[in-house]
């Protein structure tokens, strides 16, 4: 009897779908795996026989449920399928957006870029996907644990009238209001300001 | 069952142009994106463009860039491909098709509705 694959999950982020899974012991030799998906009530082989612990669904629609199964493979021995569902609209990671950001006097202006997404066009961004897209920003002073959240109304913002000569970090992350989900924050960039710009008269 | 439809398509000569045009029989082509694809011999199915209703956006495949442009006529319920500067690489059947949830642009699996496609040939 051969075991079936362990611990299968989806790994999902920007709609990057990869079924994943770990080879149970098997003392008779290497395993293989076959992974499917249902499609008009028929599974369709997706990866077939590989030797591999994972299998990139990325070309599924975005849209609906999706059933899908993987199976241990020896000789002419096969062990039962596991099945999983995955609705890759609801279920993938949003992943950290891009950030620019720049120095002017005592501002700091960034721009923010949404995450791109797997097999699309370069154009076509997380952003294109969820209708209420919108960027939560966290910025502080670099060496301090207070942390002060904004959310911008357009991909740029500028944070004005900060302390001359100091280092702020920010970070951005995807949110999505109407789901009240958030996505993954981006690396802190951490930027010095420089002179206050008003002159004393 | 909606029926999309493709015409424009034909024989023209490298460096030239041609208009598609993609219709909806009997129903308005109200869907949030409207893609065009292409199916050169012997080759998969390939995105080529799409159109967002919610905002207008276009989007393209680097292969077209600069050379097709996407457009939709809503008083005539027509979405449109422009192509200039054809080349005999952009041989292939060209189909439009429509999403019921505007979610993706360039890969199949994110289309509901398919036209029966318009055969373009580029050579001298």
């Known amino acids: 009897m051969v075991p079936p694959p362990e611990n299968v999950r989806m790994n999902s982020v920007n709609f990057k779908n990869i079924l994943q899974w770990e080879s149970p012991a098997f003392a008779k030799g290497n395993l293989t795996f076959t992974a499917q998906y249902l499609s008009y009530r028929i599974f369709q082989d997706k990866c077939m026989n590989t030797t591999l612990t994972e299998c990139d669904f990325s070309s599924l629609s975005k849209y609906g449920d999706h059933t899908l199964r993987v199976r241990a493979e020896f000789a002419d021995e096969h062990s039962d399928w596991v099945n999983i569902t995955f609705c890759p609209v609801d279920d993938t990671i949003i992943g950290p957006p891009g950030m620019q950001v720049e120095v002017l006097a005592d501002s700091l202006h960034m721009r923010f870029l949404a995450p791109k997404i797997e097999n699309e066009y370069e154009t076509w961004t997380m952003k294109n996907v969820y209708n209420s897209w919108t960027y939560n920003v966290q910025y502080w002073k670099n060496g301090t644990d207070e942390k002060f959240q904004i959310t911008p109304q357009y991909d740029f913002e500028v944070l004005r009238n900060l302390e001359p000569w100091t280092t702020y970090c920010v970070q951005v992350r995807g949110f999505l209001p109407d789901r009240n989900k958030a996505g993954e924050w981006s690396e802190p960039v951490c930027e010095q300001t420089t002179h206050d710009e008003t002159v004393p008269s | 069952e909606v029926q999309l439809v493709e015409s424009g398509g034909g024989l023209v000569q490298p460096g030239g142009s041609l208009r598609l045009s993609c219709a909806a029989s009997g129903n308005s082509l109200d869907y949030p994106t409207i893609g065009w694809f292409r199916q050169a011999p012997g080759k998969g199915l390939e995105g080529v463009s799409c159109i967002s209703a919610s905002d207008g956006s276009t989007h393209y495949a680097d292969s077209v860039k600069g050379r097709f442009t996407i457009s939709r006529d809503n008083s005539k319920n027509t979405v449109y491909l422009q192509m200039n500067s054809l080349r005999a690489e952009d041989t292939a059947v060209y189909y439009c098709?429509?999403?019921?949830?505007?979610?993706?642009?360039?890969?199949?699996?994110?289309?509901?509705?398919w036209g029966q496609g318009t055969q373009v040939t580029v050579s001298s």
């Open positions: 098709a429509a999403s019921l949830h505007g979610l993706g642009c360039k890969s199949e699996a994110d289309y509901d509705y």
